[in-house]
């Protein structure tokens, strides 16, 4: 069953009500590096895009290297995931209201293209972590996320034995792994070449229309 975006009628070209998002999408010429594909229409500012590329950025004080240095090939997927989260104006159909101190809305069950999830897992499964859900349960006493007492660092593969375990479990089901492939117009691409436009616009239109039918 498809979730409805609670209390939202505007499912297309919208920004989520969260910590760093703009209230309205629009062009951002100076989006940094991996966030640059969204520069024609974005929910993030240039400074947000710059900051999220840093290790333990001030956006969330989140440390990717909580179990030693994360492999660069792995880290780029987390940066891309954060770009999608902060910058995409095409995730309206999956916005849900939440009662959290730091944000009023979140994404739920965004249908991530299966290849994007597979590649993320392949590039990360030898890096190390200590948790299978990164939304909660950290030790924040130092101001930065640390492994909670007794949580052992092991390979990603130990905590995320399959690609779906990673993509769906990591952020409490913000994503679900789609059966559709990149370019199908039926799944959200974390990675895309903006020279061909943003393929996620078509995906959002499809799911928004399907939701209005239900």
């Amino acid at each position: 069953t498809m979730c409805s975006a609670q209390d939202r009628t505007d499912l297309l070209n919208v920004c989520m009500d969260a910590k760093h998002h703009k209230t309205k999408p629009g062009p951002e010429d100076k989006l940094h590096d991996q966030c640059s594909p969204w520069k024609k229409n974005a929910c993030c500012t240039a400074s947000t895009s710059q900051e999220l590329h840093k290790d333990t950025s001030r956006l969330y004080n989140f440390n990717w290297d909580h179990c030693g240095k994360m492999e660069p090939a792995c880290k780029r997927h987390f940066i891309q995931d954060t770009c999608l989260y902060e910058c995409s104006p095409n995730l309206g159909p999956w916005i849900q209201q939440v009662n959290q101190s730091w944000r009023k809305e979140r994404f739920l069950d965004v249908p991530l293209c299966k290849e994007d999830c597979q590649r993320w897992w392949e590039d990360c499964h030898t890096s190390h972590t200590c948790k299978s859900n990164w939304h909660r349960g950290w030790d924040w006493t130092s101001g930065v996320n640390k492994c909670p007492a007794g949580a052992l660092c092991r390979t990603f593969e130990s905590y995320f034995p399959t690609p779906a375990a990673l993509c769906e479990g990591l952020w409490s089901h913000s994503y679900k792994v789609s059966n559709y492939s990149r370019g199908s117009g039926r799944c959200i691409q974390m990675w895309f070449d903006s020279a061909q436009g943003n393929p996620n616009e078509e995906v959002a239109r499809f799911y928004a229309a399907a939701m209005h039918v239900n």
Partner: antibody, heavy 118, light 109 residues
Framework: EVQLVQSGAEVKKPGASVKVSCKAS????????MHWVRQAPGQRLEWMGW????????KYSQKFQGRVTITRDTSASTAYMELSSLRSEDTAVYYC???????????WGQGTLVTVSS | SSELTQDPAVSVALGQTVRITCQGD??????ANWYQQKPGQAPVLVIY???NRPSGIPDRFSGSSSGNTASLTITGAQAADEADYYC???????????FGGGTKLTVLG
Amino acid sequence: EVQLVQSGAEVKKPGASVKVSCKASGYTFTSYAMHWVRQAPGQRLEWMGWINAGNGNTKYSQKFQGRVTITRDTSASTAYMELSSLRSEDTAVYYCARDISYGSFDYWGQGTLVTVSS
Amino acid sequence: SSELTQDPAVSVALGQTVRITCQGDSLRSNYANWYQQKPGQAPVLVIYGQNNRPSGIPDRFSGSSSGNTASLTITGAQAADEADYYCDSRVSTGNHVVFGGGTKLTVLG
């Protein structure tokens, strides 16, 4: 650079105890499990047990249960393995090894030879 | 039972491919890890998990598994590969670990 440095060789009499140390450096000691594995001369590797260096929880092989005690000192980033009631068959090289995935040991100590002889 | 069984000895001609196997019930639900050990040295992890090589391990080493059998394959064996090879596996009940008996690999020629 990750390193596990073990204490030196020991000669013990039957019935005595031995305590081998393993000092870790180059990583956050409390974030990983440390296992102990031994190898008698010309024999296979034999798993003895492990300690969660973060909370001190231990698991031991049934073969050594009651005779082996694994501990750690987080302030010194050091794990210890104590084996009691030694017998000649305990003559072996004892290794500590860092665990990265339920039995995947990516770094090993250099080994400590314990000789049990009357 | 939580035993892992390996052939005691295997030989291969220089440059040829060799497969070393490890059998045991625990391998139906857990991956095997593979270690290389040369005389007088500590073991070295060569393959772990699904088929992961630690950095510094040549890509001629690969791992696979089917049912209750795990295999270590060395494609194009070198003289430097002559060593004892051990498999190990997690035993899910109780988070224990078990080692195989080891396979002595001889590289001929």
